[in-house]
């Protein structure tokens, strides 16, 4: 099941997936002046590697069919070299079957990557430089199915200015630790949901990639 919408934003924080679940789709997007090869519309996480490598080619000259075919034949070879690009395996990186790592950069890709996440995907939040975390729970958001719909859980993270951090800590102690209410797993009220409501801008549009894939 695909996750609708994007994960929630937290002020003065940024998030990203540290690994991608089996079935995740990444659109092959190219920056202005370049276009993707017709045969490579998206990459999909299968097992613990991506199904193909995105490639962008200049708009200014058309490659011959022969060249394109040759590039496609080299994909398997390129996929193997991808695994050699990481000399150190970090403890922070999940390396499980059914999870893919971040695909390495490809030439002339668009600056923004468009992922289509699947149920169970988690994204990890960190405060940006200059801000410190006040945490009451895990700084992650998980795409979950609830009442027949997918949505993202709210990360338990507040990022405050480093210069103000001590003041927030003091007020936290004087108030006592407030418990964030656990998610209700049983009831499915008609009007409310445990998921934060996405704004219009975060609503993820179904793209032709998905239409093609799930016909």
């Amino acid at each position: 099941e695909l996750c609708l919408y994007d994960p929630p934003e937290v002020p003065n924080a940024t998030f990203k997936a540290l690994s991608y679940k089996n079935g995740t789709i990444l659109n092959c997007e190219c920056k202005r002046g370049f276009r993707r090869l017709k045969e490579l519309v998206y990459m999909r996480c299968l097992g613990n590697s991506w199904s193909s490598n995105c490639q962008c080619t200049s708009n200014s000259h058309d490659k011959s069919r022969k060249q394109v075919t040759a590039q496609l034949e080299h994909q398997k070879e390129q996929q193997t070299t991808t695994d050699m690009q990481k000399p150190t395996q970090s403890m922070h990186q999940e390396n499980l079957t059914g999870h893919c790592r971040e695909p390495p950069p490809w030439k002339h890709e668009d600056s923004k990557r468009i992922y289509h996440f699947v149920e169970g995907q988690s994204v990890h939040y960190e405060c940006i430089p200059g801000y410190k975390a006040l945490q009451r729970g895990p700084a992650i958001s998980i795409c979950k199915m609830k009442c027949g719909k997918t949505g993202w859980t709210q990360p338990q993270l507040t990022c405050v200015d480093e210069r103000e951090h001590h003041r927030f800590l003091a007020s936290e102690e004087s108030q006592g630790s407030r418990n964030s209410s656990p998610e209700s797993e049983t009831s499915c009220p008609i009007t409310t949901t445990d998921f934060p409501q996405p704004t219009e801008t975060t609503a993820m549009t179904e793209t032709f990639v998905l239409t093609m894939e799930y016909k």
Partner: nanobody, 130 residues
Framework: QLQLVESGGDLVQPGGSLRLSCTAS????????IGWFRQAPGKEREGVSY????????YYIDSVKGRFTISSDIAKSTVYLQMNTLKPEDTAVYYC???????????????????????WGKGTLVTVSS
């Protein structure tokens, strides 16, 4: 396949300067943090410095603050590390690396410190010795 190519490593005397270059032809800079790690003999690899392509924000490990400066020339697809007042403890293989930015084109220094990068260069040796 996009590759990172480092250059500029050399033997230099303590107190001297060097400038390392990392060229990443075809890299879409504004989607990445790009910068430098180093690994001294018998030690763990450590994140020295990065610059984000989205807004040019920079990070330095404490031991190089005030001595090293990172900069980029997007037109040349190159990131530089200017290293001044070099010390024997700066001796290491210096690796160029890139890591995808997080949401809204922002980046957290903890991701760089974790050492889990999307792409690595082959490294260039810097030796500081008299």
């Amino acid at each position: 396949q996009l590759q990172l190519v480092e250059s500029g490593g050399d033997l230099v005397q303590p107190g001297g300067s060097l400038r390392l270059s990392c060229t990443a032809s075809g890299l879409t800079f504004d989607g990445y943090a790009i910068g430098w790690f180093r690994q001294a003999p018998g030690k763990e690899r450590e994140g020295v410095s990065y610059i984000t392509g989205s807004n040019g924000s920079t990070y330095y490990i404490d031991s190089v603050k005030g001595r090293f400066t990172i900069s980029s020339d997007i037109a040349k697809s190159t990131v530089y590390l200017q290293m001044n007042t070099l010390k024997p403890e700066d001796t290491a293989v210096y690796y160029c690396a890139v890591d995808r930015l997080g949401s809204r084109g922002l980046y957290a220094s903890s991701w760089w410190r974790s050492g889990d990068m999307d792409l690595w260069g082959k490294g260039t040796l810097v030796t500081v010795s008299s």
